[in-house]
Interface confidence: low
C-alpha cells in the first residue's frame, strides 16, 4: 500500500500569507507574486548576484510537529545561469543551503543561526539559461530532504542564499503514515512511519468481523517501513465456520451451504442424505435414518449402517467349520464395513444353548474382521453349532439394530487323529497320536487298522484307550499302512489319513527312533 | 556507534546444543527487531531468524524451525540463539544484525559441528 | 519460497572502471531488495536498501536500481577498496533468500 502523506506546511497552497522572516529585513529574500495560467502565484525570491558575500536567510513560520518522526521537505525552484549576468558575475552561486531548528516554542521575529542545523546544500538539476529567461521558460527544479528522527514540539526551516539568483515556488514539509489497510481479512490501523531509515514498525492486525486466527496459526501482522509502505505480511485472518470470504469481508453461509471450521476455503453445498441447512451453518443435519459417524467429515453423505452379509455357508470337516459369506448388498454407503463372528453351542440331548467363544479356536479374532471368511476348530463332537456373523460399519454403533445372518451345522464325528512314527525296528512300529482336549472326554478307544502294503487281502486291528502303540511282528524292511481311529459311543468318530510307515532293514540294527 | 558482539560459538558434537549470545551497545536495544544470519565456509549469508523490538513474535526460516529459538533481554541488552540437535551442516560463522534487513553487524562467531 | 539468482559468480575490473552486478528474483518482490558489501573476514555491510536507496556513509559511487524481479547494483569509478563480495537480498515477506554472491576483484 502507498504511505500516505500529512502536510504540516505547503507554502504554494498558503496564497503567499504565511509571512515568513527575512534576515537581514528588507535585504535579500522578496516575496514577489506573478500570474501563471491566469492565477496569482507567490515565491521567495533572491537574486543578488553583483554584490559578493550573500549571507540572505529566510526562516519559515514555527510548525507543529504533532506526530511526526520524521520529516520530508519537498522544494520546487528555478536557479539563473550565472553565465547570464554580465562578466558572469564572479560572486554568483547556483546553490543555496537548507537548514533546520527544533524548538518547544515560537521564538517569533527573534532569528539566531546559530540554532540551526544544515540539512544539504540544495544544487539545480536545471538552470535557467538567458534565452529560457527571455523566453519566460523557466527551468523548475524538484527536490527532497528528509529529517529525523525530530523530539520537539515543532520546528522552523530556513533557507540561506550565498549570492543565487533563486525563485523559491513551493515549499511543502509532511510526514508520512502507512495507511489504513485492510489485508487477509485483518485491519491495519494508519500507522505513522519510524523515523530510522530502513527500519520496520510491527504493528498487529485486526480480524475482521466473523474472522479468526487459525488454530496454531500466526496473528495477523504488518511491518510499518519509514516510508509509510506497509511490508513483510505475517500470519492472517480466516473467515469462521458458517463463513465464507466475499472480497474483504466474511458473509454468512447461503441456505444448503455450510462450512464447518475457519479456513480459506468457500461454504459447500450440504452432502447427499442431509436436510437443507439454515444460513450460516456449520454443518448440514442428516436425514432420518442416516447417521454421521464422530470421525466423519461434514464434507461426507451421511451414511447408515450395512444390510446382513449376503450368504453365508458353514461346511463342516471334521472338527472343523469354514464359514464363508459374501459383502451386504447395501453398504449404507461406507466403505468401513468389518465382521464379527459369534459362536452359541447347542448339546442334542438336553437342548441347552450357550457361548462357545472359549472352547473355539478362530483362524484369526474374529472381531474387525475385513475378510469374508474364517476357519472355527476344536469343535466337540455330537454338538450343534449356530455361527451369526454380522456385518458393521462406522455408524453401526449410532443404532441399535444389528446387520447378521447365521447358519448352523452338527458335528458328528471326532476331529481325525493326527498320528506320529515315533520309532521303528526290523520287526515293529512305535506310533502315537493325538486329537484336541475337548473331544477326548468323549473317546471310548482308539482303533489301529495296519496292513503290509500291496496287499489288500488281510488287515491286522488293534485297540487301546491310551495315545500311542507298538506294533509287533513285522517283517523286515516292509511299509505297512497304518490308520487311527476314534471309537465313542455312538459310534465310529472320523478316522486319520493313511500312513505309510516302513520298517529297519535286517543291515540295521537296534529300535532306532525317528 | 552501533556495536554489536557474539559469542558463545565453538566445537559442538552432532546432536548437540549451543546458546550464542549477542551483546549491544551504542543504541536502544529495545527499539528494535534483531536477526541472526550465518555463513557456511566460503558459502552465502543464510537467514536464520528474527525477533521483535519486546520479544513478542519470532520467525524462522523452515531450515531450523523446531530446532532453533531466538529470544532476548531487554534489561541486559542481549540477544540469544539456543541452538538444539546441530549437524555438520549448521557449521558455519553466525552473526548477529540489527533491523530485519540487518542495518548493523557483529563481526560474528564460528560454530563448528563436528565428531 | 522465492529464489535470488546472482551474476556474475566473480568480476575483474581495473581502478575507475564501471562494473554492474544483478540480481534476479524468481516472483515480483516489488522493490524490497537490498545490497550488502562484505570483505573478506569482516561482517557484512548494508550499501542499499528498497532497491535504490543508499544507506547514509556510503560512497554515491554505489547505486541500485531494479523493481519486481530484476535488479542491479553499479559501481562507478571503481576504487581498489571496493573489491569485495557483494550479497542481494529479499525482504517483502519471510522467509528472506540471499543472492549467492559476486566475488569483485581489482586488477
Known amino acids: 500500500a502507498q504511505g500516505k502523506e500529512v502536510v504540516l506546511l505547503d507554502f504554494a497552497a498558503a496564497g503567499g500569507e504565511l509571512g515568513w522572516l527575512t534576515h537581514p529585513y528588507g535585504k535579500g529574500w522578496d516575496l514577489m507574486q506573478n500570474i501563471m495560467n491566469d492565477m496569482p502565484i507567490y515565491m521567495y525570491s533572491v537574486c543578488n548576484v553583483m554584490s559578493g558575500d550573500q549571507d540572505n536567510w529566510l526562516r519559515t513560520n514555527w510548525v507543529y510537529r504533532g506526530e511526526a518522526e520524521r520529516i520530508f521537505i519537498e522544494l520546487k525552484f528555478t536557479v539563473r545561469d550565472c553565465n547570464s549576468f554580465p562578466g558572469g558575475a564572479s560572486s554568483c552561486k547556483e546553490t543555496f543551503n537548507l537548514y533546520y531548528a527544533e524548538s518547544d516554542l515560537d521564538y517569533g521575529t527573534n532569528f539566531q543561526k546559530r540554532l540551526f542545523t544544515k540539512i544539504d546544500t540544495i544544487a539545480p538539476d536545471e538552470i535557467t539559461v538567458s534565452s529560457d529567461f527571455e523566453a519566460r521558460h523557466v527551468k523548475l527544479n524538484v527536490e527532497e530532504r528528509s529529517v529525523g528522527p525530530l523530539t520537539r514540539k515543532g520546528f522552523y526551516l530556513a533557507f540561506q542564499d550565498i549570492g543565487a539568483c533563486v525563485a523559491l515556488l513551493s515549499v511543502r514539509v509532511y510526514y508520512k503514515k502507512c495507511p489504513e489497510l485492510l489485508q487477509g481479512l485483518a485491519h491495519f490501523p494508519e500507522t505513522i512511519a519510524g523515523s530510522d531509515a530502513p527500519s520496520l514498525a510491527t504493528v498487529a492486525g485486526t480480524c475482521v468481523d466473523h474472522a479468526v486466527v487459525p488454530p496454531g496459526g500466526e496473528e495477523p501482522r504488518m511491518h510499518c517501513a519509514v516510508d509509510g509502505e506497509w511490508l513483510v505480511p505475517i500470519g492472517q485472518c480466516l473467515c469462521q465456520a458458517g463463513y465464507e470470504k466475499v472480497e474483504d469481508a466474511c458473509q454468512a453461509c447461503s441456505p444448503g451451504f455450510f462450512k464447518f471450521e475457519a479456513s480459506e476455503s468457500p461454504c459447500l453445498e450440504c452432502p447427499e442424505h442431509t436436510l437443507p441447512s439454515p444460513e450460516g451453518a456449520t454443518s448440514c443435519e442428516c436425514e432420518e435414518g442416516f447417521f454421521r459417524a464422530p470421525q466423519d467429515p461434514a464434507s461426507m453423505p451421511c451414511t447408515r449402517p450395512p444390510s446382513a452379509p449376503h450368504y453365508l455357508t458353514a461346511v463342516g470337516m471334521g472338527a472343523k467349520v469354514e464359514l464363508r459369506w459374501t459383502p451386504p448388498q447395501d453398504s449404507g454407503g461406507r466403505e468401513d464395513i468389518v465382521y464379527s463372528v459369534t459362536c452359541e453351542q447347542c448339546w442334542p440331548e438336553s437342548g441347552e444353548c450357550g457361548p462357545c467363544e472359549a472352547s473355539v479356536r478362530y483362524s484369526e479374532p474374529p472381531h474387525g474382521l475385513t475378510r469374508t471368511s474364517v476357519t472355527v476348530s476344536d469343535l466337540e463332537p455330537h454338538m450343534n453349532y449356530t455361527f451369526t456373523v454380522e456385518a458393521r460399519n462406522g455408524v453401526s454403533g449410532l443404532v441399535t439394530s444389528r446387520s447378521f445372518r447365521t447358519a448352523s451345522v452338527s458335528i458328528n464325528q471326532t476331529e481325525p487323529p493326527k498320528v506320529r512314527l515315533e520309532g521303528r525296528s526290523t520287526t515293529s512300529l512305535s506310533v502315537s497320536w493325538s486329537i484336541p482336549p475337548p473331544q477326548q472326554s468323549r473317546v471310548w478307544k482308539y482303533e489301529v487298522t495296519y496292513r503290509k502294503k500291496g496287499d489288500s487281502n488281510s488287515y491286522n486291528v488293534r485297540r487301546t484307550e491310551g495315545f500311542s502303540v507298538t506294533l509287533d511282528d513285522l517283517a523286515p524292511d516292509t511299509t505297512y499302512l497304518v490308520q487311527v481311529q476314534a471309537l465313542t459311543q455312538e459310534g465310529q468318530g472320523a478316522g486319520s489319513k493313511v500312513h505309510e510307515f516302513q520298517t529297519l532293514s535286517p543291515e540295521g540294527s537296534g529300535n532306532l527312533a525317528v | 556507534q552501533v556495536q554489536l558482539l557474539e559469542s558463545g560459538g565453538g566445537l559442538v558434537q552432532p546432536g548437540g546444543s549451543l546458546r550464542l549470545s549477542c551483546a549491544a551497545s551504542g543504541f536502544t536495544f529495545s527499539s528494535y527487531t534483531m536477526s541472526w544470519v550465518r555463513q557456511a565456509p566460503g558459502q552465502a549469508l543464510e537467514w536464520m531468524g528474527t525477533i521483535s523490538s519486546r520479544g513478542t513474535y519470532t520467525y524462522y526460516p523452515d531450515s531450523v524451525k523446531g530446532r532453533f529459538t531466538i529470544s532476548r533481554d531487554n534489561a541486559k541488552n542481549s540477544l540469544y540463539l539456543q541452538m538444539n540437535s546441530l549437524r555438520a551442516e549448521d557449521t558455519a560463522v553466525y552473526y548477529c544484525?540489527?533491523?530485519?534487513?540487518?542495518?548493523?553487524w557483529g563481526r560474528g562467531t564460528l560454530v563448528t559441528v563436528s565428531s | 519460497d522465492i529464489q535470488l539468482t546472482q551474476s556474475p559468480s566473480s568480476l575483474s575490473a581495473s581502478v575507475g572502471d564501471r562494473v554492474t552486478i544483478t540480481c534476479k528474483a524468481s516472483?515480483?518482490?516489488?522493490?524490497?531488495h537490498s545490497w550488502y558489501q562484505q570483505k573478506p573476514g569482516q561482517a557484512p555491510r548494508l550499501l542499499i536498501y528498497?532497491?535504490?536507496r543508499l544507506v547514509d556513509g556510503v560512497p554515491d559511487r554505489f547505486s541500485g536500481s531494479g523493481y519486481g524481479t530484476d535488479f542491479t547494483l553499479t559501481i562507478n569509478n571503481i576504487e581498489s577498496e571496493d573489491a569485495a563480495y557483494y550479497f542481494c537480498?529479499?525482504?517483502?515477506?519471510?522467509?528472506?533468500?540471499f543472492g549467492q554472491g559476486t566475488k569483485v576483484e581489482i586488477k
Open positions: 528498497r532497491a535504490n
Open positions: 544484525a540489527r533491523e530485519a534487513i540487518f542495518t548493523h
Open positions: 516472483q515480483d518482490i516489488n522493490n524490497y
Open positions: 537480498l529479499k525482504y517483502n515477506v519471510f522467509p528472506y533468500t
